[in-house]
């Protein structure tokens, strides 16, 4: 068992844990920019999925000590286009390497305040946090 | 505010919320099998990323009312190989469509038990839960 500071309200509150809920996505620390490196813009024939992909990416750490999970990783695309399946290095302009985003549920540790405003341990504030999961090789969107 | 049954311990306990911690990943409800549909094994020129991808996938809902988040989605690949960038329909055997997995932090609501074993509200049990995020077009692994 591991102990957490209580979210328990003082007497007079309903016997419930307060969990704030917001559907407003929290932006990541940095914009999930593309990060093109011609040297690493290649699809490997071994190694992890993100290096074997024809839309390769790297992961960038986003750490917040008052958030659960404390460590999140944002994908950063290494190429603007997809890498050729044949060569593993030349880019194919017919395919775009696009970031796949996801609004992940996270929890922030916040001070809780009792009825009279006095500090009552910590509460967990539930938020949606936008993370880029991977880079995906897609056909460019054709506008109608 | 959103309310959850309390993690508040009874008198005599430290004024802390108990949170169990396990690093053992929880398997998803169903194995993340491949789900090949020749009819949907094509890369669209519009629509969401998962349908424009040359490794298209669909999402399958995994709902657990005693878990946070309650709803998780598992990617299911629609093709064994990548779809040709040129045609958007024919498969290219030089590329494999592979699932990208991630161990996501989730929380389970569990009954808490007091000193004498009596029920004392709920605790949050933190677990790692394996989810498939997307299907990625990769170069097949070449064994050394």
């Amino acid at each position: 068992y591991s102990h957490w500071p209580s979210c328990c309200p003082s007497k007079g509150y309903p016997s419930e844990e307060l969990l704030r809920w917001s559907t407003v996505p929290v932006p990541p620390l940095k914009p999930a920019s593309l990060d093109f490196h011609s040297v690493s813009c290649r699809a490997s024939e071994d190694g992890p999925l993100n290096s074997r992909a024809i839309s390769p990416w790297r992961y960038e750490l986003d750490r917040d000590l008052n958030r659960l999970p404390q460590d999140l990783y944002h994908a950063r695309c290494l190429c603007p286009h997809c890498v050729s399946l044949q060569t593993g290095s030349h880019m194919d302009p017919r395919g775009n390497s696009e970031l796949l985003y996801h609004n992940q549920t996270v929890f922030y540790r916040r001070p809780c305040h009792g009825k009279k405003g006095n500090h009552k341990g910590y509460c967990l504030e539930r938020r949606l946090y936008r993370v880029s999961l991977a880079c995906v090789c897609v056909r460019p969107r054709v506008m109608g | 505010y959103s309310h959850w049954p309390s993690c508040c311990p009874s008198k005599g306990y430290p004024s802390e919320e108990l949170l169990r911690w396990s690093t053992v990943p929880v398997p998803p409800l169903k194995p993340a099998s491949l789900d090949f549909h020749s009819v949907s094994c094509r890369a669209s020129e519009d629509g969401p990323l998962n349908s424009r991808a040359i490794s298209p996938w669909r999402y399958e809902l995994d709902r657990d009312l005693n878990r946070l988040p309650q709803d998780l989605y598992h990617a299911r690949c629609l093709c064994p190989h990548c779809v040709s960038l040129q045609t958007g329909s024919h498969m290219d055997p030089r590329g494999n469509s592979e699932l990208l997995y991630h161990n996501q932090t989730v929380f389970y609501r569990r009954p808490c038990h007091g000193k004498k074993g009596n029920h004392k509200g709920y605790c949050l049990e933190r677990r790692l839960y394996r989810v498939s995020l997307a299907c990625v077009c990769v170069r097949p692994r070449v064994m050394g």
Epitope: W4, R58, L61, L65, L68 | W21
Partner: antibody, heavy 125, light 107 residues
Framework: QVQLVQSGAEVKKPGASVKVSCKAS????????MNWVRQAHGKNLEWMGL????????SHKQKFQGRVTMTVDKSISTAYMELSRLRSDDTAVYYC??????????????????WGQGTLVTVSS | DIQMTQSPSSLSASVGDRVTITCQAS??????LNWYQQKPDGTIKLLIY???TLHTGVPSRFSGSGSGTDYTLTISSLQPEDIATYYC?????????FGGGTKLEIK
């Protein structure tokens, strides 16, 4: 016991690249982040970046953007730090340091709990 | 980036003395502070993490305190083997940053 053993001293010309290795033993290599810190002669410690050996995830100081590449080889429990386009002011001792996590789960605290012996990199024409 | 200012930059004390080193952050770092010891041969060891928790094997004469932006490392009774340079480091936010160091000498 935990040990981090670094590669030997290097002498490089300006514009060249250097790759320093750090072999870990005595613990689960993929379970701990590895930091890279440098120290120019008579100067203070400067954090360069870190890498998670499990997924290759990194973070680095902005001033090293585009010049530093941190990698790992899980099969031999070794971390690498490559610095390119070397300048004379990159002359320093380069350290790898394991990042331990402490305190009440799930809100951890982080500290560089074990350090390599350091690798002197001299950049000179 | 968070700036860490350490003082004094050097100090000389006698064996048995009580020694205090201070570290000031450019913003509140919520006790997310570590202290390290660098011996003259370059060897670096973790002394204290999270402001005041002693790392395994560190003698109890070392202690840490502080909050907000101001932190202190104290050696209650200086020993000859404590000759070293001491650094504070914040881990409140990436990038991590170190103080300028305090070189401790024996009189």
């Amino acid at each position: 016991q935990v040990q981090l053993v670094q590669s030997g001293a290097e002498v490089k010309k300006p514009g060249a690249s250097v790759k320093v290795s750090c072999k870990a033993s005595g613990y689960s290599f993929t379970g701990y982040t590895m930091n890279w810190v440098r120290q120019a002669h008579g100067k203070n410690l400067e954090w360069m970046g870190l890498i998670n050996p499990d997924n290759g995830g990194t973070s680095h100081k902005q001033k090293f953007q585009g010049r530093v590449t941190m990698t790992v080889d899980k099969s031999i429990s070794t971390a690498y730090m490559e610095l390119s386009r070397l300048r004379s002011d990159d002359t320093a001792v380069y350290y790898c340091a394991r990042e331990g996590y402490y305190g009440p789960s799930p809100f951890h605290h982080y500290a560089m709990d074990y350090w390599g012996q350091g690798t002197l990199v001299t950049v000179s024409s | 980036d968070i700036q860490m200012t350490q003082s004094p930059s050097s100090l000389s004390a006698s064996v048995g003395d009580r020694v205090t080193i201070t570290c000031q952050a450019s913003q509140d770092i919520s006790n997310y502070l570590n202290w390290y010891q660098q011996k003259p041969d370059g060897t670096i060891k973790l002394l204290i993490y999270y402001t005041s928790t002693l790392h395994t094997g560190v003698p109890s004469r070392f202690s840490g305190s502080g909050s907000g932006t101001d932190y202190t490392l104290t050696i209650s009774s200086l020993q000859p083997e404590d000759i070293a340079t001491y650094y504070c480091q914040q881990y409140s936010k990436l990038p991590y940053t170190f103080g300028g160091g305090t070189k401790l000498e024996i009189k």
